[in-house]
Amino acid sequence: MATKAVCVLKGDGPVQGIINFEQKESNGPVKVWGSIKGLTEGLHGFHVHEFGDNTAGCTSAGPHFNPLSRKHGGPKDEERHVGDLGNVTADKDGVADVSIEDSVISLSGDHCIIGRTLVVHEKADDLGKGGNEESTKTGNAGSRLACGVIGIAQ
């Protein structure tokens, strides 16, 4: 079982990032830690998408990783996609420090995110509370600014 993974986020614009994942035990939480730069100040949706396919840019990654066929939600919600990691917050310098602990994603098993795509979005994720159909699918987080395939790390 992999205990560490890494993702290098890149896009067409200035947004780039490095996100590290660590899971000490197979059923334990995953630490998600790193940084993303080139963002506008404020909240940006942050999700694991289903496919590790970036052939046509971030759009090839498909929808949020959702093996349980649930509605979109926030990371603390029972009703959420596995890939729903909520928002990252960029400061006035355009840098978002990421420090998340999530107990739904995994680096092994049915919820394994390795080989899938991590995406940072243009807008805030409304965590499924936006009151429209798109909210229950994407959180109205808008376009995909940068993405990268999550790979096993040393």
Epitope: N20, G34, K37, V95, S99
Partner: antibody, heavy 119, light 107 residues
């Protein structure tokens, strides 16, 4: 207030190793990235590598790859930089410096540790 | 590796003068460029972060500008205590690199 306190000056023989420590206080140690930068006498600043203590991940400059090891002891909020196979050109002041995360500047620096390599 | 080239290497200036130091990156680094001051026998101190933002406690006579590949550190109305070496630093990509430094001497 963040403080980085380094170990004292060292005199080493060529071919030997040196291990310099850097103890952090005044902040959440796990959310730092600690880098090591050296400065030879009368010269500029040279980045050697960094460690992310929360993940035990270290990155090294290619020039030092295989010769330097950076480790962290989270229980004491201390980072160590070990440099092997010392040569006279390694005579320098070695600084540890803190940054909040990737892409950010080094906002706090240790006082420096002079390492002299001489036979 | 991103190479940072500072200009000039050395400058001798009189108090109250305006000083400009430039830093050119070998490829675009956006605004991930920072400036440090280092006085003799002291550790470097952060002056300017992200090309143009003053770090806390830094006197207002220090300012920075630029983005992409060309950056400038300006010291308005130089004071005697500003005699030091000044370094630019990029945090855009690994390996992290520094400029070769600019030494300011006060006449």
């Amino acid at each position: 207030q963040v403080q980085l306190v380094q170990s004292g000056a060292e005199v080493k023989k060529p071919g030997s190793s040196v291990k310099v420590s850097c103890k952090a206080s005044g902040g959440t140690f796990n959310n730092f990235v600690i880098g090591w930068v050296r400065q030879a006498p009368g010269q500029g600043l040279e980045w050697m590598g960094r460690i992310i203590p929360i993940l035990d991940i270290a990155n090294y400059a290619q020039k030092f790859q295989g010769r330097v090891t950076i480790t962290a002891d989270k229980s004491t909020s201390t980072v160590y930089m070990e440099l092997n196979s010392l040569r006279s050109e390694d005579t320098a002041v070695y600084y540890c410096a803190r940054t909040g995360n990737y892409y950010k500047p080094y906002d706090y620096w240790g006082q420096g540790t002079l390492v002299t390599v001489s036979s | 590796e991103i190479v940072l080239t500072q200009s000039p290497d050395f400058q001798s200036v009189t108090p109250k003068e305006k000083v400009t130091i430039t830093c050119r990156a070998s490829q675009s680094i956006g605004s991930s460029l920072h400036w440090y001051q280092q006085k003799p026998d002291q550790s470097p101190k952060l002056l300017i972060k992200y090309a143009s933002q003053s770090f806390s406690g830094v006197p207002s006579r220090f300012s920075g500008s630029g983005s992409g590949t060309d950056f400038t550190l300006t010291i308005n109305s130089l004071e005697a205590e500003d005699a030091a070496a000044y370094y630019c630093h990029q945090s855009s990509s690994l390996p992290i690199t520094f400029g070769q430094g600019t030494r300011l001497e006060i006449k």
